[in-house]
């Protein structure tokens, strides 16, 4: 059942963007979806520097000084455990086979907090977004992206890393979140479900969308990802929900049409450069923002999450291709690669628009008016 849309805006432009997010049945995450905090890890359970993962595998950036042994972005593998109660719990295990890079698998032991203590942190991602409780913050101005329209050459690396499909982005893609918050895009990847089962990481009033795109950025204040991990604002992720629409999305088709070539875990191909901004919604002015974490071990906090209010439309066939083409570790289909939503623990989600006004049909509970924390432009 689909409930009225979050905001009755007509979509801007057209292209890849759909209308604003529809809400679904109340399906709030259950208590056991949160990472367990008992059983703190022993010394041997902590990942070494070379094992540090991030929000999927982060592509390499040239550090200002090429130090021997410094963490490269390629050394950051990750995986999310499915977040619905019927799915395996929020656990993963490390796998050191083949190229000796760490991999994370769905299900199994040990629990994430034992692998990386930060996964039991208080300010984790993803979260459930409740527009009625979001703080309208007029200081949150429209996002600005620079250099996201890429020419066909040089080609970009598209890789099945065993837990997502990831496109490594070249230098020169800049994103501005506001005063003192300039970022460079590193990579983008997707999260999805399975046939008839949605797989977005964030949810809206408990509604999970079919899929979600993440564009991961590094603050220009840092030369390397390992320097930025855990630092407030060191990393920023743009997130958008993908949902089913009547037409094929030509921007996404440039990637989805190549998935068969990388069906096997660890395989990769080269794809022509494309308009990365066309993979995102067209309305850069309406979004939610909060501080959270990487959605996979090491679950480093301080990540600025910006979740678009407007969704992106893909055809049913495209969503099926996304969820039914790739294979993960152990001859298992790469599906349901999302983490359970995490408790806010007092965090306030800010909105760049008055999201609480007529944004949800549920008026049973009183609306809490949260105040905007951001400073003006």
């Amino acid at each position: 059942q689909r409930l009225p849309r979050m905001q009755e805006d007509s979509p801007l432009g057209g292209g890849s963007s759909g209308e604003d997010d529809p809400l679904g049945e109340e399906d709030l995450p259950s208590e056991e979806d949160s990472p367990r905090e008992e059983d703190p890890p022993g010394e041997e359970d902590l990942p070494g520097e070379e094992d540090l993962p991030g929000e999927e595998d982060l592509p390499e950036v040239k550090p200002k000084s090429e130090e021997e042994g410094s963490l490269k972005l390629e050394d950051l593998p990750t995986v999310e455990a499915p977040g619905d109660p019927q799915e395996p719990q929020n656990n993963a295990h490390r796998d050191k086979e083949g190229d000796d890079q760490s991999h994370w698998r769905y299900g199994g032991d040990p629990p994430w907090p034992r692998v990386s203590p930060a996964c039991a942190g208080r300010f984790q991602s993803p979260v459930d977004i409740r527009p009625q409780l979001a703080a309208f913050c007029p200081a949150l101005r429209p996002l600005e992206l620079l250099g996201f329209q890429l020419p066909p050459l040089p080609e970009l690396r598209l890789r099945n890393n065993g837990h997502s499909v990831q496109l490594t982005l070249p230098p020169g893609l800049e994103m501005a979140l506001g005063p003192g918050r300039e970022y460079r895009a590193l990579q983008l990847h997707l999260h999805w479900g399975a046939a008839g089962r949605p797989g977005s990481e964030h949810t809206v009033e408990g509604h999970r969308f079919p899929a979600e795109i993440h564009v991961v950025h590094l603050s220009t204040a840092f030369a390397r990802v390992d320097e930025a991990l855990g630092r407030p604002g060191g990393l920023a992720v743009l997130a958008a929900f993908l949902e089913e629409g009547p037409e094929e999305n030509s921007a996404y088709e440039q990637l989805l049409s190549r998935l068969e070539e990388i069906a096997e875990e660890g395989s990769e191909t080269q794809v022509p450069g494309l308009d990365i901004s066309a993979l995102l919604p067209s309305d850069f002015s309406r979004y939610f923002q909060y501080e959270g974490s990487l959605t996979t071990p090491p679950c480093a906090q301080g990540v600025i999450w910006t979740v678009f209010n407007q969704t992106v439309m893909l055809s049913a066939k495209q969503l099926h291709t996304l969820s039914d083409t790739l294979w993960g570790p152990g001859d298992s289909r790469l599906q349901l690669n999302f983490r359970a939503t995490q408790p806010l623990n007092g965090r306030v989600i800010e909105a760049s628009f008055p999201a609480g006004v007529d944004s949800s049909p549920r008026a049973a509970e009183p609306v809490q008016l949260n105040s905007c924390l951001a400073a003006g432009d």
Epitope: G15, E144, Q149, A176, R181, T220, D275, S282, F284, S285
Partner: antibody, heavy 119, light 107 residues
């Protein structure tokens, strides 16, 4: 009050050099992207060069690459444009422009300094 | 490079008229478009950013709209002091490019 004051323009022979300066006041200079934009007499606007807040990212118009250098001194609140191997087609009014805080769009412009390249 | 094709190149209208200036980008620039006003002998002045956001202090008769490749600046009720050149600019991709300008004259 935001103020941008350009200086350093003048008449120079082809092949010559000039260094333009833009003195900024009324805002925290080190937080802002800055650009040089030029306008040939009776013509439209053209972005010449841009630099991010810490000077780590620079951009140049293709026709000035290798000849012009944009730089900034955040301690002195000053933006520079070093112009070498000047050509007649570089003749224009050169504006210093500030970008919105933390963003790429420009919000304040100086009054400009005129560069004339002629033999 | 992204071309910004601005039209008309000039127009003449009466005080109180509604004036529309259009700008077409040669490729998708999302909403990364700004509009500037340049009065004779002066530096450009900011009007609109992110396609439709008016800067503080800009009269509300000025409005911007559009997304993707087609953008519009509208002056809902032309005033005598609006005599100027108007430029659109995209800042989605380097090189940031400006439209050719529209000269607005008062009849």
């Amino acid at each position: 009050e935001v103020q941008l004051v350009e200086s350093g323009g003048g008449l120079v022979k082809p092949g010559g050099s000039l260094r333009l300066s833009c003195a900024a006041s009324g805002f925290t200079f080190s937080n802002y992207y800055m650009s040089w934009v030029r306008q040939a007499p009776g013509k439209g606007l053209e972005l010449v060069a841009a630099i991010n807040s810490d000077g780590g990212i620079t951009y140049y118009l293709d026709t000035v690459k290798g000849r012009f250098t944009i730089s900034r001194d955040n301690a002195k609140n000053t933006l520079y444009l070093q112009m070498n191997s000047l050509r007649a087609e570089d003749t224009a009014l050169y504006y210093c422009a500030r970008h919105r805080s933390g963003y790429f769009s420009m919000d304040y412009w100086g009054q400009g300094t005129l560069v004339t390249v002629s033999s | 490079d992204i071309q910004m094709t601005q039209s008309p190149s000039s127009l003449s209208a009466s005080v109180g008229d509604r004036v529309t200036i259009t700008c077409k980008a040669s490729q998708n620039v999302v909403s990364a478009v700004a509009w500037y006003q340049q009065k004779p002998g002066q530096a450009p002045r900011r009007l609109i950013y992110s396609a439709s956001n008016r800067y503080t202090g800009v009269p509300d008769r000025f409005s911007g709209s559009g997304s993707g490749t087609d953008f519009t600046l509208t002056i809902s009720s032309l005033q005598a002091e609006d005599l100027a050149d108007y430029y659109c600019q995209q800042y989605s991709n380097y090189p940031w490019t400006f439209g050719g300008g529209t000269k607005v004259e008062i009849k």
